[in-house]
Amino acid sequence: MKVLQEPTCVSDYMSISTCEWKMNGPTNCSTELRLLYQLVFLLSEAHTCIPENNGGAGCVCHLLMDDVVSADNYTLDLWAGQQLLWKGSFKPSEHVKPRAPGNLTVHTNVSDTLLLTWSNPYPPDNYLYNHLTYAVNIWSENDPADFRIYNVTYLEPSLRIAASTLKSGISYRARVRAWAQCYNTTWSEWSPSTKWHNSYREPFEQH
């Protein structure tokens, strides 16, 4: 039994890191393998992650971690019974994929303005709380070409757009994702989408 693709890990910079790897053949990850991990820290202890299958030869492990700080470094040991298959390390702050924003809501009762709000996925004491920026994707269910992205580069988790920038009388969906420039993160997954019917009063045209 050998590792074909070494484990690669990403952290949510909060409490979970996800490691994926591939074996050289079909493997029952949960019965044959164990991933041991330990924070390099005087008061830490070793933990064991039981991997799950991720395709025939693929394995994935969800590591429960202490609240992350930038200096953290974890040792990783992949075992098959008594055989050490791979040894490595992982710095969560160097491989961050933020959590997805939640609670996306479209407020349509603000005088021909659409107000989209969502929740920051981190608690205020987390470093990423004040460093997230967002991308909001709005698209029409009727017209695949009517697809737009709004970049929200300020900290407030909200976006205002004029209802008239979208077509009236049809349904739209929106979703939002996050990233943090400070740690050069990847984008988060998209939030669940939310749907609304766009309608607004056409301005009265005088002739």
Epitope: V40, L43, A71, D72, D125
Partner: antibody, heavy 115, light 109 residues
């Protein structure tokens, strides 16, 4: 908002015992290492003890064998049992949250050791 | 045990001046584990700098940290009235644990 509130300080005679408590709120207590740091009157800061998320502990040489740190994750509480107290243990005792350094501190509780 | 020695013991300066505080370690310290704190009378310490040079959230940019190995510096570019306080450096070591310097008092001249 992160809050750490110490209690249990007071006047104790040399050789006596005291138990300090720290009530934590505003964060996931179980995922954080916790510490006690003290400051004698007019002196500098001294790290006393720390406890990891899994219960691993460490102590300054000056308190080893006399002090015991513990935590109750269900109650979001940190404790310091201090036995065989000496005059040099008189200090403000701070509860702190952190790891390699301490971003969050309580306001401290004063322990006076005097006969 | 790693010993941190801060100098000077007291720094007498006027508002608007630049303050340079030194922290010297008895053996090499990882920059990732070097921090600076500010403490005012009757208050708990406040983290200013971590990782030798990263400002903690909410700390004004007049505070900066630098250094590596055994020599570290905290600089306050222009002293404000609220900056007069005692400053401590602190290090963490995987075997020796946590130690603080003895402090530098920045007082009004």
């Amino acid at each position: 908002e992160v809050q750490l509130v110490e209690s249990g300080g007071g006047l104790v005679q040399p050789g006596g015992s005291l138990r300090l408590s720290c009530a934590a709120s505003g964060f996931t207590f179980s995922r954080n290492a916790m510490f006690w740091v003290r400051q004698a009157p007019g002196k500098g800061l001294e790290w006393v003890s720390g406890i990891g998320t899994g219960g691993a502990t460490s102590y300054a040489d000056s308190v080893k064998g006399r002090f015991t740190i513990s935590r109750d994750n269900a109650k979001n509480s940190l404790y310091l049992q201090m036995n065989s107290l000496r005059a040099e243990d008189m200090a403000v005792y701070y509860c702190a949250r952190g790891r390699y350094y301490f971003p969050w501190w309580g306001q401290g509780t004063l322990v006076t050791v005097s006969s | 045990e790693i010993v941190l020695t801060q100098s000077p013991g007291t720094l007498s300066l006027s508002p608007g001046e630049r303050a340079t505080l030194s922290c010297r370690a008895s053996q090499s310290v990882s920059s990732s584990y070097l921090a600076w704190y500010q403490q005012k009378p009757g208050q708990a310490p406040r983290l200013l700098i971590f990782g030798a040079s990263s400002r903690a959230p909410g700390i004004p940019d007049r505070f900066s940290g630098s250094g590596s190995g055994t020599d570290f510096t905290l600089t306050i570019s222009r002293l404000e009235p609220e900056d007069f306080a005692v400053y401590y450096c602190q290090q963490y070591d995987h075997s020796a644990g946590w130690t603080f310097g003895q402090g530098t008092k920045v007082e009004i001249k």
